[in-house]
Interface confidence: low
């Protein structure tokens, strides 16, 4: 037989299929010009010493072969003895290691079999009603195709699917979208309506992220509040990497996940802007306020589920930084100003109540007064901090109040509202004999003692009703008892107690009269 012809004799090897897993596969045959044809195939397994034979059976039942040697591609003309206008059945037999391996058969009409290309160029991927939609431009002069896809995940083998017939300048396919796992897709095409026509090669991989972007494994921590009233937010661990299918490893456009940081400043709700979104790599400085921090994972299908962390407020207090003066017209606060043209946010809430009950006031931008102080005043009618209870006050400052990450904490402290001097008056003052010339004075703690740092001291006053002599005794704010000594028997005394703050003298308690009885000897 001539090499250019299909040889109508028995092939030079025994006719037995070894049934091994390796061997020839993916046979494709098509017309490549007006009178020339090509068949190509893949061979899986060791290629050393393998000889390939392209087998062909005509509709008459006669069969022939082309010897291809070690090549996996063979061309022949319409004069090679193979009928090109009628249906033929083709397959490949590979003779290797004393055994024959056979490919699956293809049955087709060679003249009408055109070499189809897989989708070329960009494949647009989008989400449609919970499914994946792929769209591409039909290769030139190839309108009218059947399209198949195959897909796999990092953990599963290829699965085959059908896109159905296509008959337009653009072709598309609906495919399954995985919720939590990346997928690799490949597409192939063949001529529509041509019985037995060969499939194209598979397209380049299309890498598709999961519908839900992977959540990063991150832990946040905040540093101590610095002298400037700011603290750094730091990230403890990098985002988790998405596992990719084999063909998507390395560079896998389409599976990228971007992580963004969303800050929500919970304190000072009267400011203009409460949230800000940043890139995850850029760790911001925060004030001492309370924040919610969310990490938003996004891929080409949009954002996924948020992970949210709460960063509690820094509760370190400055007991002396805030001066409060109470007058007939109202109350004024003074504190060391930060800089020129600063906006301040003053926030207060009753101690022991939920943070949701915080009230705040935003000042207009202000410069320091001649003493370098910033101020905030309010009238009694406004009702601000008007109740006689302990308030926690925080003052924040910013030169750019519209920028969430530029706020700083000026100070945090406690303040007793309303008429503190009267409300703080100690009650239940009692006098007990202690010795022949001394007594013990006890009282119930002042309401001011519930407010950390507010009560500066107690003062106990003792008045000799005979001589009108008065003595005053300062007592630590943590004590509620004092011993008065050097008293004379038979003299009437009155005792009173008051509670003082750093800026306010308290109101004396009701006078308590007592005297030490004269001891009469038997």
């Amino acid at each position: 037989c001539r090499t250019s012809e299909c040889c109508f004799q028995d092939p030079p090897y025994p006719d037995a299929d070894s049934g091994s897993a390796s061997g020839p596969r993916d046979l494709r045959c098509y017309r490549i010009s007006s009178d020339r044809y090509e068949c190509s195939w893949q061979y899986e397994g060791p290629t050393a010493g393998v000889s390939h034979f392209l087998r062909c059976c005509l509709s008459s039942g006669r069969c022939c072969y082309f010897a291809a040697g070690s090549a996996t591609r063979l061309q022949f003309s319409d004069q090679a003895g193979v009928s090109v206008l009628y249906t033929v059945t083709l397959w490949v037999e590979s003779w290797a290691r004393n055994q024959t391996e056979k490919s699956p058969e293809v049955t087709l009409q060679l003249y009408n079999s055109v070499k189809y290309e897989p989708p070329l160029g960009d494949i647009k991927v989008s989400k449609l009603a919970g499914q994946l939609r792929m769209e591409w431009e039909t290769p030139d002069n190839q309108v009218g195709a059947e399209v198949q896809f195959r897909h796999r995940t990092p953990s599963s083998p290829w699965k085959l699917g059908d896109c159905g017939p296509q008959d337009d300048d653009t072709e598309s396919c609906l495919c399954p979208l995985e919720m939590n796992v990346a997928q690799e897709f490949q597409l192939r095409r063949r001529q529509l309506g041509s019985q037995g026509s060969s499939w194209s090669k598979w397209s380049s991989p299309v890498c598709v992220p999961p519908e839900n972007p992977p959540q990063p494994q991150v832990r946040f921590s905040v540093e101590q509040l610095g002298q400037d009233g700011r603290r750094r937010l730091t990230l403890k661990e990098q985002p988790t990497q998405l596992e990719l299918p084999e063909g998507c490893q390395g560079l896998a456009p389409g599976t990228e996940v971007t992580y963004r940081l969303q800050l929500h400043m919970l304190s000072c709700p009267c400011k203009a802007k409460a949230t800000r979104t940043l890139h995850l790599g850029k760790m911001p400085y925060l004030s001492g306020a309370a924040y919610n921090v969310a990490v938003i994972s996004s891929n080409q299908f949009g954002p996924g589920l948020n992970q949210t962390w709460h960063i509690p407020a820094d509760t370190h207090t400055e007991p002396v930084a805030l001066n409060i003066s109470v007058g007939t017209n109202g109350t004024t606060m003074y504190w060391p100003a930060r800089a020129q043209s600063m906006t301040y946010c003053i926030e207060w809430q009753p101690v022991g109540q939920d943070g949701g009950l915080a009230t705040c006031s935003l000042t207009a931008p202000q410069d320091p007064d001649p003493a370098g102080m910033a101020t905030y005043s309010w009238s009694r009618e406004s009702g601000a901090m008007g109740q006689e209870k302990c308030y926690y006050i925080t003052i924040f400052a910013s030169a750019h109040p519209e920028k969430l990450t530029l706020w700083s904490t000026v100070l945090s402290t406690y303040h007793f509202g309303g008429n503190a001097s009267a409300a703080g008056t100690p009650h239940h003052v009692s006098v007990k004999n202690h010795s022949l010339d001394s007594v013990s004075v006890d009282w119930a703690p002042s309401l001011l003692s519930t407010c950390p740092g507010v009560l500066k001291e107690y003062v106990v006053r003792c008045r000799d009703e005979d001589s009108k002599q008065v003595s005053e005794h300062p007592v630590q704010p943590t004590e509620t008892q004092v011993t008065l000594s050097g008293l004379r028997a038979g003299v009437a005394y009155t005792v009173q107690v008051r509670a003082d703050t750093a800026w306010l003298r308290g109101v004396w308690s009701q006078p308590q009269r007592f005297s030490i009885e004269v001891q009469v000897s038997d």
């Epitope: 953990s155 939590n180 796992v181 990346a182 999961p210 992977p214 494994q217 988790t240 998405l242 596992e243």
Partner: nanobody, 123 residues
Framework: QVQLVESGGGLVQPGGSLRLSCIAS????????MKWVRRPPGKGLEWVSV????????KYSDAVRGRFTISRDNAKNTLYLQMNSLKPEDTAVYYC????????????????RGQGTQVTVSS
């Protein structure tokens, strides 16, 4: 609290072998698939191998298939990675990681990983 402690790393010549161990605590080890991942110098994390909760389902990355063997001992709460025919490109910090579920393929992510053990392959 989940804790994963790797050991067994070190310096080895090309062609040599090492056996990494990972002792797990703070969770029911036998309920979770376990993975080895690695970070070569100057690169991102690479997935190496995974074994499901019961052990029969095992998968390896192409880079290590045929040379590395993953195994686990649920009674000892320990994960192993036997590394043979080591190459310079296997140089990395190796981390043991806990999967999100029991199946080796129930999740593409791991939830926790250890501090890592350094493997250096050099002549």
């Amino acid at each position: 609290q989940v804790q994963l402690v790797e050991s067994g790393g070190g310096l080895v010549q090309p062609g040599g072998s090492l056996r990494l161990s990972c002792i797990a605590s703070g969770f029911t080890f036998s309920d979770y698939a376990m993975k080895w991942v690695r970070r070569p110098p100057g690169k991102g994390l690479e997935w190496v191998s995974v074994i499901d909760s019961e052990g029969p389902t095992i998968k390896y990355s192409d880079a290590v298939r045929g040379r590395f063997t993953i195994s686990r001992d649920n009674a000892k709460n320990t994960l192993y990675l036997q590394m043979n025919s080591l190459k310079p490109e296997d140089t990395a910090v190796y981390y043991c990681a806990k999967s999100n579920g029991g199946s080796a393929f129930s999740s593409v992510l791991y939830t926790d990983r250890g501090q890592g053990t350094q493997v250096t392959v050099s002549s």
